[in-house]
């Protein structure tokens, strides 16, 4: 039960995280105009990975795409690449994890195959989350650098009379969405990796004693039993000790009560 819950929760958390990464990548507000010096501006600027926008106080918003590839800063290109890699890995991870879910049954897929798929998707989610966090952090670092550079020469005197106020940019909503989404994807990936351990078939032999409440004799069962790979009622190879991880898919082989030692 705990394995299924961990796997299911990992999948849901990763799904939310990847949706957030996609949303952050598409958002226009990666950087927003710093209003510290002019809180009542009639023109508000904000920029995304793909276009820059201007919102006037009249309600009019104008966005212009970056229609050049070569003319864009290398850092922006790197952030775009990291976010896209994160989305692609996350999407593949989601696809793999759907088939790996313990609650979804596909043919006679073995637990070992599901475990491998869960681990694969978990690793993909972790890398996806790290890509998103890295991308957002690189952009944030770029903003901080530019912010202090523009602060250093904020007012350029022109003939001692005229002021040219340079537009400074600060963190936009997309950065926070990206950080949170990347973190969720990462957590989801870790949960999938943890669930994978519980899904892996037990190879270790355990000494177990089965007490039958209905009978008077005590049946000692030396030697281990491997988990049944089928979904049916294989009662001969019933695993006596399951390391505390019981699943809803497990079939109770005997009608009698069992106490595990």
């Amino acid at each position: 039960m705990a394995v299924t819950a961990c796997q299911g929760l990992g999948f849901v958390v990763s799904l939310i995280g990847i949706a957030g990464i996609i949303a952050a990548t598409c958002m226009d507000q990666w950087s927003t105009q710093d209003l510290y010096n002019n809180p009542v501006t009639a023109v508000f600027n904000y920029q995304g990975l793909w276009r820059s926008c201007v919102r006037e106080s009249s309600g009019f918003t104008e966005c212009r795409g970056y229609f050049t590839l070569l003319g864009l800063p290398a850092m922006l290109q790197a952030v775009r690449a990291l976010m896209i890699v994160g989305i692609v890995l996350g999407a593949i991870g989601l696809l793999v994890s759907i088939f790996a879910l313990k609650c979804i049954r596909i043919g006679s897929m073995e637990d070992s195959a599901k475990a491998n798929m869960t681990l694969t998707s978990g690793i993909m989610f972790i890398v996806s989350g790290l890509c998103a966090i890295a991308g957002v952090s690189v952009f944030a670092n770029m903003l901080v650098t530019n912010f202090w550079m523009s602060t250093a020469n904020m007012y350029t005197g022109m003939g001692g009379m005229v002021q040219t106020v340079q537009t400074r940019y600060t963190f936009g909503a997309a950065l926070f969405v990206g950080w949170v989404a990347g973190g969720l994807t990462l957590i989801g990936g870790v949960m999938m990796c943890i669930a994978c351990r519980g899904l892996a078939p037990e190879e270790t032999n355990y000494k177990a004693v089965s007490y039958h409440a209905s009978g008077h004799s005590v049946a000692y069962k030396p030697g281990g039993f491997k988990a049944s790979t089928g979904f049916g009622s294989n009662t001969k190879n019933k695993k006596i000790y399951d390391g505390g991880a019981r699943t809803e898919d497990e079939v109770q082989s005997y009608p009698s009560k069992h106490d595990y030692v």
Partner: antibody
Framework: DVQLVESGGGLLQPGGSRKLSCAAS????????MHWFRQAPEKGLEWVAF????????YYADTVKGRFTISRDNPTNTLFLQMTSLRSEDTAMYYC????????????WGQGTSVTVSS | DIVMTQSPSSLTVTAREKVTMSCKSS????????????LTWYQQKPGQPPKLLIY???TRESGVPDRFTGSGSGTDFTLTIRSVQAEDLAVYYC?????????LGSGTKLEIK
Amino acid sequence: DVQLVESGGGLLQPGGSRKLSCAASGFSFSNFGMHWFRQAPEKGLEWVAFISGGSSPIYYADTVKGRFTISRDNPTNTLFLQMTSLRSEDTAMYYCARFRRGGNAMDYWGQGTSVTVSS
Amino acid sequence: DIVMTQSPSSLTVTAREKVTMSCKSSQSLFNSGNQRNYLTWYQQKPGQPPKLLIYWASTRESGVPDRFTGSGSGTDFTLTIRSVQAEDLAVYYCQNSYSYPFTLGSGTKLEIK
């Protein structure tokens, strides 16, 4: 056709109050920001206040801040300017104007309503 | 607050003459985000409310004759009337549309001989 009609002006006492109205028609009122401007006799234009389509944000000129309140009633397509603590320097022709979507410019103006503050 | 300075305060010209009037701002009205200058020109004829002529420093409002041209960038702007007509007798105001409070110049009064 876009129309803006101001009303509520008149002769007022210093320290008095008055609410100006601007009835709008011919356009989707709630989609546009609105401004009040004024023009003292034989003087230039002065911007007074702004209210966005959704009633927030609101901005005022320093000369009227704390004394004047701009508001709007979108269902009745009406813009208001509540004036309190009136001074002689508030004597002017008051105009309401529609904020053009794009360019931060006023594309339609009312004919104005005259406010005279005198004892 | 941004201070708008217009010059000359008045000018008298003959019909069909070319007229230029200047407007200077104490701060740049150029917005790097969309590469536009937030300066607006209005025309106010005697006894009438103002009328929008030019926005974004050089974009003519629909219905405005093409003899009116706005130019300039940053802090220096010009309104040019290519061939003045009798009906152009008015006061012309420039306005900062970049930041609140919106400030206007004192106006240039155009008179026709």
